[in-house]
C-alpha cells in the first residue's frame, strides 16, 4: 500500500541496501523511490543527540515482506518509497539547502552573483549533480561568492556538514530546466570509446539509452547487439563518460549501436517505462515468484503488481496443459536490470510498468494518427480542449491544450474583454461542440495568468496559462502534451498538426467536430519574407503551405500546433495571429512555445 | 541538384580569424553529418572536423582543435567553420563534405572548395 | 591514430591497362575503408566505400576488395579521363585519416 507520511523518531531496523548522503528526509524518499530496489529507508537528521558523522545518512532498504521492525531513535526519521503509490513522481528538487555543504568532487570553480545564478550554471553544465555556493557573508574573502560544482557517481552528496554562510542545491535538468542540447538520435554501427562507468544488460539500445539517462553518471552509450559477433557482450549496455561531456572519437563497428544521455529533455521522453515486449528472449535474475499467467500481457501486469518484480519473463503453455495457462516467472535484480539475455528459447520477456509513473505522463502512447481527412476522432488529441465563456450567452472562446492536471495552456489574446475567470469553462474530452449541453461535466478557472509582457498578438508574448478549479483525471480521452524541451531547439520538426473547432474559411462558422490539419514549418527568415510590415521574432514559429489552402482560423486560437517527435507529441506552437486565412503565401503565426517553457514552469510550479 | 558551395576564404595574416561558410542545398540538410576536409598546396586530403546533423556533437582534428570551431545553422542550409589563431600549415582548400552511408565516415558530396592563405 | 599508406604514389600506364593501388592501415578497419578519385583543380570524387562497393553513377571498371589491413583497388580497363589523383580513406574510426595519393598518368 502507499505510504507517504514520513515516521518521525522511527527507524526501520535491517534490510539495509546502502547508504547515501541526502540533505533532507524527503529527498531520502525521493532517492529511496528512484532506487531500483528500495522499499523503505531511515534518514538521520542533525540533532546534538546525533554523532555528526551520521547527520543527513539516508539508509536505502530492503524487505521482502515490504515493510520492516520498527525502533524508537531521536532525529530518525524513517518512511516508504513512493514506488507503492499511483501516483506522479518527480525527480525535481528546487529547495536551497542554507548552511550546508554538499561535498562531491569540485569540478569548477568561479564566480556567480547569487545562489540561483550558481544553480543555473550546474543545471546547464553536463557534469554537475550538485553545488555549494559561498555567500558574500562567507567569513574568507577570496571565497565569498564562489560556486562550487560538483558531481559524484551516485549523483548524490559524499557527506554533507554544516558550513555557515553557504547554500548548496541539486541540478535542475530533471525538473526541464536545462538548456543543454539533446541528442536524441541513435547511431548504428557505431561504437564510443572513453571511460565506461558501469554497464549492465539491456534488450535493445532503446532501453540502454533509458538506463543511460537517468543513470546519474552516463553522458552516452554503447549497445552491442544480439548479433555482435564476441557472444559474451552481446545485449551488453555500456554506460559512458568523457571530461568534455561527449564522445572524443566516433568508431564505426558493425552490430553495435550508440547514442546520448537525454538528461536535459527527460520530462519529454520515456525514462523508466519500458513497454515492449521481447520475444524468444529470456531475462535472467533473483526469482521472486513464479506464477501460471493466461498470457505475456497478463505476466507482465503481475509483475507491476508486485512490487518488488523489476521484470519477468514469461514461458507459453506446451499444448493443453494447465488451462492453457503459461508459467510467469517474476524476477529482480541489484541493479533493475536482467544478469543476462538469452534468445532461442522461446521466452517473452519485458519490464514492470510500475516504474511508468516515473515519467511524465505526457510521454504515455496515444493511439494512431488517423490519416487523411480533416475531421478528428475520438482520443486524437487527448490535450485539446475547449475554452467556453458563458457570458452573454454560452459559445466556444478558443482552444487550449492539457499541460500538467491543473493547467491549461492558451493564447493571451482570447481573453480580451473577459473581466472575470467565473465566466469560462473548460471543457475536456470533446470530439463534438453538440456533445456539451446543461449537465456535460466542465472544469472552472480558478485564474487566468497572462503573460506581463503581453499588449497584443502581433507584438508576441501572446501565451495565457489557466489555472483549473480542480485536477483533471487523466484518461485516453484526456491527457496533457509535453513541452518542448529547451535542449531540442535544434529539432527540425517534420510532423505537425493545427487542430480546433474553428472557422474553415474567414467568413464561416465554429465547426462542430473538432478539424485537423497537416501543416509544415516554415522558417523565420521566410515568415518574416510574408509580413513584411510586422516583426517575426524568435519567440514565434511559423506554419503553412506556401499555396495556402490549410491554416488555423478564427476559433482556432490558442490551441495546439502539435508536433511529434521520437514518437512523443510535443507542443511547439499556440495559436496566435495571420493574415486571413489559409491564403497564399502567407503562413499563419504560432507563439513558440519552447521560448516560454521557464516562464510556464515558474507560473505553474509556483508554490 | 545536390549542391555544397563553400565561400569566405581569402589571405590572412598568422595568428588571424576567418570564417568560412558552406551553402547547402538539393537534399534534407538537416539530417546528415557534415565535415571539413583541407588540402594543402599540392598536398594530401586532411579530415579538419565533422558536426552531428543536430549541431550538438562536433569532432576535430588534433591540429585544429581549441582553435577552429565548427557549426551549423539548419534553417538556412549552412555549414560554418570559425578558423582562430591561424598559422602558415593552415594554408589550403577548405572543401566542405556530406557524410554518407550508415555510421558516415564517407564523403559523397563535396564543394568545390575555398582557399585559405595564412602569411605575412 | 590511423595511418594509411598508399602505394605506388604515383603510376604511369597506357589507355587499356589493368591498373591496381594498394592501401594498408596501421590497424584493423574491417572492410572500412573508401577511394576517391580527385581532378586537377576540382573536388575529391567517392568512387568505393566500405572497400567495395561502388557509389551510384560510378563505371564498373572501378572495383575494391580487401579487408583487416589490406586493400585494392582496381581500374580493368583505364581510360584517358581517368587521369587523377587516387586517395584511400579509412572510416573505421575518428580521426578519419586519407592514404597520400596515387597520381595516375598515362603512358
Known amino acids: 500500500e502507499c505510504v507517504t507520511q514520513l515516521l518521525k523518531d522511527t527507524c526501520f531496523e535491517g534490510g539495509d541496501i546502502t547508504t547515501v548522503f541526502t540533505p533532507s528526509a524527503k529527498y531520502c524518499q525521493v532517492v529511496c523511490t528512484y532506487h531500483p530496489r528500495c522499499l523503505l529507508f531511515t534518514f538521520t537528521a542533525e540533532s546534538p543527540s546525533e554523532d555528526p558523522t551520521r547527520w543527513f545518512t539516508c539508509v536505502l532498504k530492503d524487505s521482502v515482506t515490504e515493510t520492516l521492525p520498527r525502533v524508537n531513535r531521536t532525529a530518525a526519521i524513517s518512511g516508504y518509497s513512493f514506488k507503492q503509490c499511483s501516483h506522479q513522481i518527480s525527480a525535481c528538487n528546487k529547495d536551497i539547502y542554507v548552511d550546508l555543504d554538499m561535498k562531491g568532487i569540485n569540478y569548477n570553480s568561479s564566480v556567480a552573483k547569487s545562489a540561483q545564478e550558481c544553480q543555473e550554471r550546474c543545471t546547464d553544465d553536463v557534469h554537475c549533480h550538485f553545488f555549494t555556493y559561498a555567500t558574500r557573508q562567507f567569513p574568507s574573502l577570496e571565497h565569498r561568492n564562489i560556486c562550487l560544482l560538483k558531481h559524484t557517481q551516485t549523483g548524490t552528496p559524499t557527506r554533507i556538514t554544516k558550513l555557515d554562510k553557504v547554500v548548496s542545491g541539486f541540478s535542475l535538468k530533471s525538473c526541464a530546466l536545462s538548456n543543454l542540447a539533446c541528442i536524441r538520435d541513435i547511431f548504428p554501427n557505431t561504437v564510443f570509446a572513453d571511460s565506461n562507468i558501469d554497464s549492465v544488460m539491456a534488450p535493445d539500445a532503446f532501453v540502454c539509452g533509458r538506463i543511460c539517462t537517468h543513470h546519474p553518471g552516463c553522458l552516452f552509450f554503447t549497445f552491442f547487439s544480439q548479433e555482435w559477433p564476441k557472444e559474451s557482450q552481446r545485449n551488453l549496455c555500456l554506460l559512458k563518460t568523457s571530461e568534455s561531456g561527449l564522445p572524443s572519437t566516433r568508431i564505426k563497428k558493425s552490430k553495435a549501436l550508440s547514442g546520448f544521455s537525454l538528461q536535459s529533455c527527460r520530462h519529454s521522453i520515456p525514462v523508466f517505462c519500458h513497454s515492449s515486449f521481447y520475444h524468444d528472449t529470456d531475462f535472467l535474475g533473483e526469482e521472486l515468484d513464479i506464477v501460471a499467467a493466461k498470457s505475456h500481457e497478463a505476466c507482465q501486469k503481475l509483475c507491476t503488481n508486485a512490487v518488488r518484480c523489476q521484470f519477468f519473463t514469461y514461458t507459453p503453455a506446451q499444448a493443453s496443459c494447465n488451462e492453457g495457462k503459461g508459467k510467469c516467472y517474476l524476477k529482480l535484480s541489484s541493479n533493475g536490470s536482467p544478469t543476462k539475455i538469452l534468445h532461442g528459447r522461446g521466452g517473452i520477456s519485458g519490464y514492470t510498468l510500475r516504474l511508468c509513473k516515473m515519467d511524465n505522463e505526457c510521454t504515455t502512447k496515444i493511439k494512431p494518427r488517423i490519416v487523411g481527412g480533416t475531421a478528428s476522432v475520438r482520443g486524437e488529441w487527448p490535450w485539446q480542449v475547449t475554452l467556453h465563456t458563458t457570458s452573454p450567452t454560452q459559445r466556444h472562446l478558443c482552444g487550449g491544450s492539457i499541460i500538467g492536471n491543473q493547467w491549461i495552456l492558451t493564447a493571451a489574446h482570447c481573453f480580451y474583454g473577459v473581466e472575470s475567470p467565473k465566466i469560462l469553462r473548460v471543457y475536456s474530452g470533446i470530439l463534438n461542440q453538440s456533445e456539451i449541453k446543461e449537465d456535460t461535466s466542465f472544469f472552472g478557472v480558478q485564474e487566468i495568468i497572462i503573460h506581463d509582457q503581453y499588449k497584443m498578438a502581433e507584438s508576441g508574448y501572446d501565451i495565457a496559462l489557466l489555472k483549473l478549479e480542480t485536477t483533471v483525471n487523466y484518461t485516453d480521452s484526456q491527457r496533457p502534451i509535453c513541452l518542448p524541451s529547451k535542449g531540442d531547439r535544434n529539432v527540425i520538426y517534420t510532423d505537425c498538426w493545427v487542430t480546433g473547432w474553428g472557422y474553415r474559411k474567414l467568413r464561416d462558422k465554429i465547426q462542430n467536430t473538432l478539424q485537423k490539419a497537416k501543416i509544415p514549418l516554415v522558417t523565420n527568415e521566410e515568415c518574416q519574407k510574408r509580413y513584411r510590415g510586422h516583426k517575426i521574432t524568435h519567440k514565434m514559429i511559423c506554419a503553412g503551405y506556401r499555396e495556402g489552402g490549410k491554416d488555423a482560423c478564427k476559433g482556432d486560437s490558442g490551441g495546439p500546433l502539435s508536433c511529434k517527435h521520437n514518437e512523443v507529441w510535443h507542443l511547439v506552437g499556440i495559436t496566435s495571429w495571420g493574415e486571413g486565412c489559409a491564403q497564399r503565401e502567407r503562413p499563419g503565426v504560432y507563439t513558440n512555445v519552447v521560448e516560454y517553457v521557464d516562464w510556464i514552469l515558474e507560473k505553474t510550479q509556483a508554490v | 541538384e545536390v549542391q555544397l558551395l563553400e565561400s569566405g576564404g581569402g589571405l590572412v595574416q598568422p595568428g588571424g580569424s576567418l570564417r568560412l561558410s558552406c551553402a547547402a542545398s538539393?537534399?534534407?540538410?538537416?539530417?546528415?553529418?557534415m565535415t571539413w576536409v583541407r588540402q594543402a598546396p599540392g598536398k594530401g586530403l586532411e579530415w579538419v572536423s565533422s558536426?552531428?546533423?543536430?549541431?550538438?556533437?562536433?569532432l576535430y582534428a588534433d591540429s585544429v582543435k581549441g582553435r577552429f570551431t565548427i557549426s551549423r545553422d539548419n534553417s538556412k542550409n549552412t555549414l560554418y567553420l570559425q578558423m582562430n589563431s591561424l598559422r602558415a600549415e593552415d594554408t589550403a582548400v577548405y572543401y566542405c563534405a556530406r557524410e554518407v552511408g550508415a555510421a558516415g565516415f564517407a564523403f559523397d558530396i563535396w564543394g568545390q572548395g575555398t582557399m585559405v592563405t595564412v602569411s605575412s | 591514430d590511423i595511418q594509411m599508406t598508399q602505394s605506388p604514389s604515383s603510376l604511369s600506364a597506357s589507355v587499356g591497362d589493368r591498373v591496381t593501388i594498394t592501401c594498408q592501415a596501421s590497424?584493423?578497419?574491417?572492410?572500412?575503408l573508401n577511394w576517391y578519385q580527385q581532378k586537377p583543380g576540382k573536388a575529391p570524387k567517392l568512387l568505393i566505400y566500405?572497400?567495395?562497393n561502388l557509389e551510384t553513377g560510378v563505371p564498373s571498371r572501378f572495383s575494391g576488395s580487401g579487408s583487416g589491413t589490406d586493400f585494392t583497388f582496381t581500374i580493368s580497363s583505364l581510360q584517358p579521363e581517368d587521369i587523377a589523383t587516387y586517395y584511400c580513406?579509412?572510416?573505421?574510426?575518428?580521426?578519419?585519416?586519407f592514404g597520400g595519393g596515387t597520381k595516375m598518368e598515362i603512358k
Open positions: 590497424q584493423d578497419i574491417s572492410n572500412y
Open positions: 558536426i552531428w546533423s543536430s549541431g550538438g556533437w562536433t
Open positions: 566500405d572497400a567495395s
Open positions: 538539393g537534399f534534407t540538410f538537416s539530417t546528415y553529418w
Open positions: 580513406q579509412q572510416s573505421s574510426s575518428t580521426p578519419l585519416t
